[in-house]
Structure formats: structure tokens, C-alpha cells
Interface confidence: medium
């Protein structure tokens, strides 16, 4: 490898640019050294002296090679619906992400500005699209032959059990009740639970309001921060 010995400051020739980790100082008209992450420019360079760098103070940071006069302030502490996934250090900002059971309704450059609880599909409705770190759950009415009897952000509609003799027919929110002793399951697809957004933290549950009557529609419910759609519980 070629020897790369620093010799800043220096004047760039026409047609050439300053090297990596150097910047062009308009006042000195020289290529000067940048400060490393975790530092800032305490004294700017001159024609005869290079940039003087100093460490960032507590609760401030610089993530990139820079020549800023002051380090950036770390973001405010994470709210109760968030977890701190990256601490504030001299080289990186604090990053807050949503707790399990919540999704990011308003993101920022890194992490999340506003978390919201994942929609819970009420009985008669199942999860059509699971929640992710950045999107809410989408619920759908259980199709004929399927049901969901839970208020959940993860349960999908399950097939009714097939009875030799039916005592009570199933509906969208209740399984069929058989009189025979050996009911059989239909072959409709079916894992019961869908995965939550990835997290290593403990589950944070919300109190669940009483479910209301399920409508007899069969469309996918809208996403978004509008008032709770039918088939889902309020936030």
C-alpha cells in the first residue's frame, strides 16, 4: 500500500480535490483535517496550522468525520412506549424504537418519533396483514367457514371444526359445537398465531375494551391513524 502521511494544511491544485477525511477551508483556502467521530472543531485551520479537534461533551455527539464547531445534542430520553436500542455516546445519537405490541406511526431519521399500539382484531375478525415495526395490523372479517373468538393483534381466522353431528353451527366469532365425540378439523390452512414485530423486550399489553357487534362485511379494513375501523378495538 502507498504511504499516506498527513501533511495538512495544504493548497489543492486546480483540478484536484482534498482527500478523504479532509475538507477545503474557504477562509484559509487550504485542505485541512476533519475531526473524527466523537470530536468537533475547536479551532479552525489557518494557512500554517491544522484544525484543532476536541472531544464532544456529555449528551452530545458527532457520528461522521466533520469540522462542525459544536457537537450535536443527543435526542431526548425514550418515552414509556419505547425502548432505547442505542445509547447516547460521543459518536452516536440515542435511538428509541417501539416496544413489542406497538409500531412506529411517525419515524425519524433513526428510530421512532411516535409509537402507537398495534390494532387488535375483535371476535369475528382475524389478522389479514400482521403488524411490523412500521405498519399497523390490518383486520379482515372471517370468511364463511372460519372464525376468530379472540381480541388479538396476532390471531388469524381459523377454520370451523367439522362435526359428524352439529349441535351449534359456527359463525364468524364462534367455532362449531359438535355432539359427536370425534370432531375433525377441516383442511383449511392454518397456523393460529402470527409473529409480532421483532423485539427482545417483554410484552407490553394494553387493556382491551369490550368487543362490539361484528358487521357482516367482507372487505379489508383500512390502515392508518383515522378513528378505529370496524372490526378493531380502539387504541
Amino acid at each position: 500500500l502507498p504511504a499516506q502521511v498527513a501533511f495538512t494544511p495544504y493548497a489543492p491544485e486546480p483540478g484536484s480535490t482534498c482527500r478523504l477525511r479532509e475538507y477545503y477551508d474557504q477562509t484559509a483556502q487550504m485542505c485541512c483535517s476533519k475531526c473524527s467521530p466523537g470530536q468537533h472543531a475547536k479551532v479552525f485551520c489557518t494557512k500554517t496550522s491544522d484544525t484543532v479537534c476536541d472531544s464532544c461533551e456529555d449528551s452530545t455527539y458527532t457520528q461522521l468525520w466533520n469540522w462542525v464547531p459544536e457537537c450535536l445534542s443527543c435526542g431526548s430520553r425514550c418515552s414509556s412506549d419505547q425502548v432505547e436500542t442505542q445509547a447516547c455516546t460521543r459518536e452516536q445519537n440515542r435511538i428509541c424504537t417501539c416496544r413489542p405490541g406497538w409500531y412506529c406511526a411517525l419515524s425519524k431519521q433513526e428510530g421512532c418519533r411516535l409509537c402507537a399500539p398495534l390494532r387488535k382484531c375483535r371476535p369475528g375478525f382475524g389478522v389479514a396483514r400482521p403488524g411490523t415495526e412500521t405498519s399497523d395490523v390490518v383486520c379482515k372479517p372471517c370468511a364463511p367457514g372460519t372464525f376468530s373468538n379472540t381480541t388479538s393483534s396476532t390471531d388469524i381466522c381459523r377454520p370451523h371444526q367439522i362435526c359428524n353431528v352439529v349441535a351449534i353451527p359456527g359463525n364468524a366469532s364462534m367455532d362449531a359445537v359438535c355432539t359427536s365425540t370425534s370432531p375433525t378439523r377441516s383442511m383449511a390452512p392454518g397456523a393460529v398465531h402470527l409473529p409480532q414485530p421483532v423485539s427482545t423486550r417483554s410484552q407490553h399489553t394494553q387493556p382491551t375494551p369490550e368487543p362490539s357487534t361484528a358487521p357482516s362485511t367482507s372487505f379489508l379494513l383500512p390502515m392508518g391513524p383515522s378513528p378505529p375501523a370496524e372490526g378493531s378495538t380502539g387504541d
Epitope: V5, F7, Y10, E13, G15, S16, T17
Partner: antibody, heavy 119, light 111 residues
């Protein structure tokens, strides 16, 4: 690999004209400033002219100002030197060279083309 | 006369260390512009040896090193070898001339 190939040299009478070409390959031509350097027989190196990557900025040595014109065709990856009103003291091997993007210096050179100005 | 001043010749025995000086002025080295060094073997085009005072392009042996301080610069060659016999040129940008300038060249002879 980077290659620079000059052509267009030859014998010309004083007051005459000649156009040198330098075909470049093996690098992003538009990203580099280019230059012409000459060397009279048995003498040292003399910078002649330079041009920026886009072609907007040009530079000339006092000895050729007003007589020589540097240009480039980036679509053809070719550098040119139009030499008019040639004099006996312009006799030299003419090299085209690529200017280093960082710090400066001419990092690649062609093999040179001989221009002889004589009656 | 060249804007950058070099000795016309230097010599040394194989294995020895030699230095070639290059003296500039306030409008080139003194203005902060770097020094570049070229080696020209007989009958060939110049080759960049050192650029930006001290930087060796890949493929250049570490026997070659550059130095600059104020308005003067130097090229040092250690462990001199027969194949180092060549002409050596220093070069910089000159702000008063708005152009690039070369030293007159130094012929290195390996005894």
C-alpha cells in the same frame, strides 16, 4: 489499466500548425483534469497546458499562451492540443498526462509524440 | 532558469543513501502547494514517484521517500540500486504563474 496514447506529431515548418491527440482508456475520463507536458531534446520537463475534467477551465504556460489551445472530447475520451504559429523552440516530445484527483501531481503519462519545427 | 531549483547531478554507490534537493518560493511551496517527484529512465516517459510531499503511489518501493518544509523539499533514496540511475524532477503548482512548474532535473549516477 490506465492508458494514454498520443498521436499527431511530426515535422512542421515555423509558423505552421499541428494538432496533437491523446486517446485515453482504462479510467473515467471526465473525472480527471488532463495536461500536456513537453521535453525539448536533451532538456528538462516543461508544463504546457491543462484542462479540467469537464473542459470548462483551461490553463496555459506563458510560453504558449495565445498560440496553443487545449480541448477535450469527453464522448470520445480524447484530449487535444491545437498548436498554431509554431516556433523552433516548440520542438519537443509532447506528453499527455492525467492529473491525480487528490493532492495533485501527474499520475499517468503517455509515451509521447515528437514535434519537430524546422524549415 | 527553472522556478524550482535542483542540483544538476548527484551520485552514490550501490547500497548508499542519496538525497536530491528542490528549492521553491513563497508562490509554490510557501503557498502550501505540495511537491511531486518524477523518475525518468533513459528513453522513457516520466513516472510519478512521490506526490503530495510524502505519498508513494502503489508499486513504488519504500526506498523512495519525500519531505517538504517551508520553501524547500527533498527526495531521499536509500539502498541505492543500479536501476535507480535516471533523471529526477520535482514539480509543484505556482500561484503567481497560475500553472505547474518543474525543477530543472537532477541526473542520478550510480557509481
Amino acid at each position: 489499466q490506465v492508458q494514454l496514447l498520443e498521436s499527431g506529431g511530426g515535422l512542421v515548418q515555423p509558423g505552421g500548425s499541428l494538432r496533437l491527440s491523446c486517446a485515453a482508456s482504462g479510467f473515467s475520463f471526465t473525472s480527471y483534469a488532463m495536461t500536456w507536458v513537453r521535453q525539448a531534446p536533451g532538456k528538462g520537463l516543461e508544463w504546457v497546458s491543462g484542462i479540467s475534467g469537464g473542459g470548462a477551465a483551461t490553463f496555459y504556460a506563458d510560453s504558449v499562451k495565445g498560440r496553443f489551445t487545449i480541448s477535450r472530447d469527453n464522448s470520445k475520451n480524447t484530449l487535444y492540443l491545437q498548436m498554431n504559429s509554431l516556433r523552433a523552440e516548440d520542438t519537443a516530445v509532447y506528453y499527455c498526462a492525467r492529473q491525480s484527483q487528490y493532492v495533485g501531481g501527474f499520475d499517468y503519462w503517455g509515451q509521447g509524440t515528437l514535434v519537430t519545427v524546422s524549415s | 532558469q527553472s522556478v524550482l531549483t535542483q542540483p544538476p547531478s548527484v551520485s552514490g554507490a550501490p547500497g548508499q543513501r542519496v538525497t536530491i534537493s528542490c528549492t521553491g518560493s513563497s508562490s509554490n511551496f510557501g503557498a502550501g502547494y505540495g511537491v511531486h517527484w518524477y523518475q525518468q529512465l533513459p528513453g522513457t516517459a516520466p513516472k510519478l514517484l512521490i506526490h503530495g510531499n510524502t505519498n508513494r503511489p502503489s508499486g513504488v518501493p519504500d526506498r523512495f521517500s519525500g519531505f517538504k518544509s517551508g520553501t524547500s523539499a527533498s527526495l531521499a533514496i536509500t539502498g541505492l540500486q543500479a536501476e535507480d540511475e535516471a533523471d529526477y524532477y520535482c514539480q509543484s503548482y505556482d500561484s503567481s504563474l497560475s500553472g505547474w512548474v518543474f525543477g530543472g532535473g537532477t541526473k542520478l549516477t550510480v557509481l
